[in-house]
Interface confidence: low
Amino acid sequence: KLTIESTPFNVAEGKEVLLLVHNLPQHLFGYSWYKGERVDGNRQIIGYVIGTQQATPGPAYSGREIIYPNASLLIQNIIQNDTGFYTLHVIKSDLVNEEATGQFRVYPELPKPSISSNNSKPVEDKDAVAFTCEPETQDATYLWWVNNQSLPVSPRLQLSNGNRTLTLFNVTRNDSASYKCETQNPVSARRSDSVILNVLYGPDTPTISPSDTYYRPGANLSLSCYAASNPPAQYSWLINGTFQQSTQELFIPNITVNNSGSYTCHANNSVTGCNRTTVKTIIVTELSPVVAKPQIKASKTTVTGDKDSVNLTCSTNDTGISIRWFFKNQSLPSSERMKLSQGNITLSINPVKREDAGTYWCEVFNPISKNQSDPIMLNVNYNALPQENLINVDEQLYFQGGSGLNDIFEAQKIEWHEARAHHHHHH
């Protein structure tokens, strides 16, 4: 069967197309090409008589067509109007006619697109931006790229106008990116240059650094304020509510206790019309903001009840601190047998009694900080039991031999565990 194949089927403007004939019959008188789906003398392109090898142009001949002896037709320098059907009419030697129709489509070579925007400086959480891919081209498909990736799925992104317009609703700073559009048709694909979206935002809540609260007299106070903002924020400082200066950094040399107070950083973005503040408390003091952990020293840790006395000393290198003592979570002294001396550094128990057995610890503190010692265990024996009757297994105290005192050691074992639990809780 006579057939026509278009090579290629989709043709770019300015290029050429070959209408290739298959299964051409033998013993031909001649053939003619027509524009359209039927034989119409008014639309004849060219005729060819085999005997004379003569080609005759018809009314639809444009000068761009070439006919080959095998009946194929080449059309050069294709224009948009060439789109459509072409019919080959074959006249055999027996004057019996045969026809076949083929077709092709013509598309323009796409120009490089560009992006127009309705808002070049949108404000975060407030504005929308519409990007439009120019120019509008018939039969073109429009695609969008963000940072060279295909569009993410988001309820804030909307495509319209045949995908030619991309709208971002309620822009955020994360929408600040490179945007490109691409146009495609069957014969070409072109991508635009990047447009970088600049979203205005902020200021966010300012951060004052460094984070220190406590300063010693004579030190230099240097504070810096930063708030994420586009365009960058303008900064001002207030001390105890009074305006000081319009700078990002605040510097006060050789501070005194009079410089203690509340320091406010005010950040303003004149374009977005937003402002934010952060307040920081500064304390200028001779006191140490970090009190070191004290240590307890005992004159002895195992004593004989109603006979021995004991001195516990709370050692610290810090100055300007106070000391307090604790026994079984109770503040000391708790009886007349207990005495504090040397500014509470030493706790004396004289004489020691059964109820004094257990854990002791001291705490050092100043108005702005405190720290506790590790606990110390005081063992109280009666009947002058020899020391070797006490054994230590896995930090638990047991009584070996003797009689009538197991309850006391069991109580001491419980106290020891309480002390260990307290110690782990606080450290």
Epitope: S178, S194, N198, Y201, A228, N230
Partner: nanobody, 119 residues
Framework: EVQLVESGGGLVQPGGSLRLSCAAS????????IGWVRRAPGKEEELVAY????????RYADSVKGRFTISADTSKNTAYLQMNSLRAEDTAVYYC????????????WGQGTTVTVSS
């Protein structure tokens, strides 16, 4: 296609000067902020200088204040980093990076240019 190309790196003696350039194509730098970032082995990445071309805002790391100057020529679509009084600790690969918003990371990076300060 967006492209950033750095140049101007090289070997210089302590106390010497260099001028780094960052030529941009595929976008207009007047709507962006540009940072110079350096990376040295065993050190944290450091944003040494930053300029927002639409406001003229600049910011410098403490380590380069008074020695480095960042600038941009929007007509040439190029940013510069003038480095004076160079020290051994300034040795690094210097990258220029652009962002269209302040303080939130970078959209595009160049390939970097190496600066070596050594006697």
């Amino acid at each position: 296609e967006v492209q950033l190309v750095e140049s101007g790196g090289g070997l210089v003696q302590p106390g010497g000067s260099l001028r780094l350039s960052c030529a941009a194509s595929g976008f207009n730098i007047k709507d962006t902020c540009i940072g110079w970032v350096r990376r040295a082995p065993g050190k944290e990445e450091e944003l040494v200088a930053y300029i927002c071309n639409y406001t003229g805002y600049t910011r410098y790391a403490d380590s380069v204040k008074g020695r480095f100057t960042i600038s941009a020529d929007t007509s040439k679509n190029t940013a510069y980093l003038q480095m004076n009084s160079l020290r051994a600790e300034d040795t690094a690969v210097y990258y220029c990076a652009i962002t269209s918003y302040h303080g939130q990371g970078y959209n595009y990076w160049g390939q970097g240019t190496t600066v070596t300060v050594s006697s």
